[in-house]
Interface confidence: low
């Protein structure tokens, strides 16, 4: 049976086997087409989600679709039901928490009272007073908290207590990529991890340990990517994996937070990378133990210079490393998180590509997660 499962796929009605390599090849080889059903699926970027959260204390903002203007949500008459609606609009299904925070001196959006209409947040029709002088600070999910804070050093062995959201994404029991838990159902990773194998069946996720292969594997229900853009082949290197069964969170299995839409990280901002990737650029071997390293944001202009990536780094990407080189992600780290710590840990980047590993002028290039929030929310909403 193991051999059969490894090399063949069973079609139903009538029952017969086809070679597994015919799965997800774009041809309907089973009469009912089930060989093309459980494949990596593409999902368009979709419409603008009309709610978002700002890095200013996770305050809620609402889009007025008529004018295209964003407004800050006033705390007046804001209810649990409105909080749930806001989070559902972003695709969350967990119970949110919210509180009032004072309008700050840098408030640059108009503040309006919020109401609900057809399960979407709307601005109240009148001119929107905000007598409380407070905004809504909203958290859709408890995320980004770990049991242990990493020490700031170069590269060292990591503990799952520090990075409980890190997962190993495996095909046929082999580690292929890293990934991050975003909520009980969803793992974030890179789209290029699935270029070779587009059938969902053989992909598994392992969570809750810092050692490769020492923890149970989780079945995957769906793998979703953005439509491939041949004009920018390195763009859109992001994927979401939906687990067959929701994770139970614990000290070693927890979600990381998505970034805020306005999370603009300036050059030299300290960040962290983790992975089981190759420890030497040419060959070497996969690390059995999770490794962590502190890096920093590298200016895109510097990253696109003539002696570096010569314009290949787009606005939907970011560079990170250390100016003198030597600390970088490598093969096998792909799909893992580039992380920033404010009050919580946020996944600001996804390990994507680079020339070599750890070169001084060619740092790691990461998918900028904030550029894809809208896509993530639309995928989650479609799957709610």
């Amino acid at each position: 049976k193991v051999i059969l499962d490894k090399y063949y796929f069973l079609c139903g009605q009538p029952l017969h086997f086809i070679p597994r390599k015919q799965l997800c090849d774009g041809e309907l080889d089973c009469p009912l087409g089930e060989d093309e059903e459980h494949c990596v699926k593409s999902f368009p970027e979709g419409p603008a989600v009309a709610v978002r959260l700002s890095k200013d204390r996770s305050t809620l903002q609402v889009l007025d679709s008529a004018t295209g203007n964003w407004f800050s949500a006033c705390f007046d008459n804001f209810t649990e039901a409105l909080a749930e609606t806001a989070c559902r609009q972003m695709g969350y299904s967990s119970k949110p928490t919210f509180r009032a925070v004072e309008i700050g001196p840098d408030q640059d959006l108009d503040v309006v009272e919020i109401t609900e209409n057809s399960q979407e947040l709307r601005m109240r029709n009148s001119s929107g007073p905000c007598l409380s002088g407070s905004l809504v600070s909203l958290h859709c999910l408890a995320c980004g908290k770990s049991l242990k804070t990493p020490r700031v050093v170069g590269v060292e062995e990591a503990s799952v207590d520090s990075w409980p959201w890190q997962v190993s994404i495996q095909y046929d029991k082999q580690h292929v990529c890293g990934g991050s838990i975003l909520d009980p159902h969803w793992v974030l990773t890179a789209a290029h991890c699935f270029r070779k194998h587009t059938d969902v069946f053989n992909w598994k996720v392992r969570a809750g340990s810092d050692k490769l292969g020492s923890f149970p594997s989780l079945a995957v229900a769906k793998i979703i990517i953005i439509e491939f853009n041949p004009m920018y082949p390195k763009d859109n290197d992001i994927a979401l994996m939906k687990l067959q069964f929701p994770l139970t969170f614990s000290g070693t299995v927890r979600p990381i937070c998505l970034p805020f839409f306005d999370e603009e990280l300036t050059p030299a901002t300290p960040l962290w990378i983790i992975g089981w990737g190759f420890t030497k650029q040419n060959g070497g071997k996969m690390s059995d133990i999770l490794l962590q390293a502190s890096v920093q944001v590298i200016d895109s202009t510097r990253c696109n210079a003539d002696d570096a990536y010569q314009g290949e780094v787009t606005e939907k990407m970011m560079c990170a490393g250390i100016p003198e080189g030597g600390v970088d992600t490598c093969q096998g780290d792909s799909g893992g998180p580039l992380m920033y710590q404010s009050d919580q840990w946020h996944v600001v980047g996804i390990v994507s590509w680079g020339y070599g590993c750890g070169g001084p002028s060619t740092p790691g290039v990461y998918t900028k997660v904030s550029a894809y929030l809208n896509w993530i929310y639309n995928v989650w909403k479609a799957e709610l």
Partner: antibody
Framework: QVQLVQSGAEVKKPGASVKVSCKAS????????MHWVRQAPGQGLEWMGR????????NYAQKFQGRVTMTRDTSTSTVYMELSSLRSEDTAVYYC???????????????WGQGTLVTVSS | DIQMTQSPSSLSASVGDRVTITCQAS??????LNWYQQKPGKAPKLLIY???SLQSGVPSRFSGSGSGTDFTLTISSLQPEDFATYYC?????????FGPGTKVDIK
């Protein structure tokens, strides 16, 4: 400290126009809506309208629509209220008043300008 | 437009008295109500916002209560500097409207 200083008293003939200024200081001018309220002698307070100093967007009370124009000059942190086709019943003290909280349209007015008396008389 | 009414229109009181002024809105305005004090020849001054929140710098003898359509301003112990006219104002919707005022003078 936050201060609103208005222009001096005016005497106008019926049918003329008056333009009252209100110079703001001590805070980020573009962040706070400014409203205009008037008070006829011995009478109560009457709201005329508001302006968003950042965008210049205005909203006027129906009663003054077509006769009032509110503008701002961000370079001098000044808002203006111009009332045209004056009649004797427009004789009043005109106040500019800033909203209490930044970014909010009207959560109570604080502070107020000292007021400008406009007398309309033939 | 939302109509605001105040009562009484005037009252005479002595220093140390407890004074209560009421304000009624023609429709439900939740807690979108502010109270102002105005002295002759001066601009109004914000005392209470959001029906019951005391504006900073305002003495604690002033308090506000109410929600919906009925609101109250209370001065727990009248001081000489409190003789003035008091206005309520709704900011629930545009146009902003004020009550006609309550004049508090010395008995």
């Amino acid at each position: 400290q936050v201060q609103l200083v208005q222009s001096g008293a005016e005497v106008k003939k019926p049918g003329a126009s008056v333009k009252v200024s209100c110079k703001a200081s001590g805070y980020t001018f573009i962040g706070y809506y400014m409203h205009w309220v008037r008070q006829a002698p011995g009478q109560g307070l009457e709201w005329m309208g508001r302006i968003n100093p950042n965008s210049g967007e205005t909203n006027y009370a129906q009663k003054f629509q077509g006769r009032v124009t509110m503008t701002r000059d961000t370079s001098t942190s000044t808002v203006y209220m111009e009332l045209s086709s004056l009649r004797s019943e427009d004789t009043a003290v005109y106040y500019c008043a800033r909203v209490r909280v930044r970014g909010v349209i009207h959560p109570g007015f604080d502070p107020w300008g000292q007021g400008t008396l406009v007398t309309v008389s033939s | 437009d939302i109509q605001m009414t105040q009562s009484p229109s005037s009252l005479s009181a002595s220093v140390g008295d407890r004074v209560t002024i009421t304000c009624q809105a023609s429709q439900d305005i939740s807690n979108y109500l502010n109270w102002y004090q105005q002295k002759p020849g001066k601009a109004p001054k914000l005392l209470i916002y959001a029906a019951s929140s005391l504006q900073s710098g305002v003495p604690s003898r002033f308090s506000g209560s109410g929600s919906g359509t009925d609101f109250t301003l209370t001065i727990s112990s009248l001081q000489p500097e409190d003789f003035a006219t008091y206005y309520c104002q709704q900011s629930y919707s545009t146009p902003v409207t004020f009550g006609p005022g309550t004049k508090v003078d010395i008995k």
